[in-house]
Interface confidence: medium
């Protein structure tokens, strides 16, 4: 996983990573949907 997020606590880091993972999944689905629609 990426280390590129500033944080001062591991729990905050973990939460930011979870958000990042979620956004990647959502954006990935949207991209796949757009390709499908084409």
């Amino acid at each position: 996983h990426s280390d590129g997020i500033f944080t001062d606590s591991y729990s905050r880091y973990r939460k930011q990573m979870a958000v990042k993972k979620y956004l990647a999944a959502v954006l990935g689905k949207r991209y796949k949907q757009r390709v499908k629609n084409k």
Partner: antibody, heavy 121, light 111 residues
Framework: EVQLVESGGGLVKPGGSLRLSCAAS????????MSWVRQAPGKGLEWVAT????????WYPDSVKGRFTISRDNAKNSLYLQMNSLRAEDTAVYYC??????????????WGQGTTVTVSS | DIVLTQSPDSLAVSLGERATINCKAS??????????MTWYQQKPGQPPKLLIY???NLDSGIPDRFSGSGSGTDFTLTISSLQAEDVAVYYC?????????FGGGTKVEIK
């Protein structure tokens, strides 16, 4: 097979320094966050330090902050703990542990056998 | 810091009987629907061994007589049918807030 082997423990005088090492094998070391956990004789477990897979971020409890430094060399599959200004209360078995990949839950799924640090004059 | 209080300190259970260990946190260890509570088993002279993560998920290779439950501040580790090899000290650990903290341990013995 995942293996973690600690070394570098020993007897040191109060105020002295020691560097612990942990050799990792059997997994993609750079993909995992790693920790050090210690256990004083006859006592429970205490978290000492954590480092991210790429080594960019580190965390410590107040009890060791400013005295201990966790680091890693991913090219050598090795984890380190530099311990300075050692105190009698730092006497413990020090374990190297791998964090699970489960959404950074903080659980540690593989542990080494530990290395003993004794701080005494 | 989040303080984890385990009870009882020690427990003697007959072979085949149920063993229940409690872990109470001084504040919630939940975040976004997940509980950041872990359970470990430690036998004499050995390092801790991961049993359960995220309060109720059994780690791979752990017998299903072990189970975890709870959320918020109250958690339980249950051994449904105690076996001789389960004699050990059991620790809970939270990782929702820094610093990560462990409970004081519960020693499980055979009655």
């Amino acid at each position: 097979e995942v293996q973690l082997v600690e070394s570098g423990g020993g007897l040191v005088k109060p105020g002295g320094s020691l560097r612990l090492s942990c050799a990792a094998s059997g997994f993609a070391f750079n993909n995992y966050d790693m920790s050090w956990v210690r256990q004083a004789p006859g006592k429970g477990l205490e978290w000492v330090a954590t480092i991210t897979g790429g080594g960019s971020y580190t965390w410590y409890p107040d009890s060791v902050k400013g005295r201990f430094t966790i680091s890693r060399d991913n090219a050598k599959n090795s984890l380190y703990l530099q311990m300075n200004s050692l105190r009698a209360e730092d006497t413990a078995v020090y374990y190297c542990a791998r964090l699970t990949g489960y959404d950074q839950a903080g659980a540690m799924d593989y542990w080494g056998q530990g290395t003993t640090v004794t701080v005494s004059s | 810091d989040i303080v984890l209080t385990q009870s009882p300190d020690s427990l003697a259970v007959s072979l085949g009987e149920r063993a229940t260990i409690n872990c109470k946190a001084s504040q919630s260890v939940d975040y976004d629907g997940d509980s950041y509570m872990t359970w470990y088993q430690q036998k004499p002279g050995q390092p801790p061994k991961l049993l359960i993560y995220a309060a109720s998920n059994l780690d791979s290779g752990i017998p299903d007589r072990f189970s975890g439950s709870g959320s918020g501040t109250d958690f339980t580790l249950t051994i449904s049918s105690l076996q001789a090899e389960d004699v050990a000290v059991y620790y809970c650990q939270q990782s929702n807030e820094d610093p990560w903290t462990f409970g004081g341990g519960t020693k499980v013995e055979i009655k």
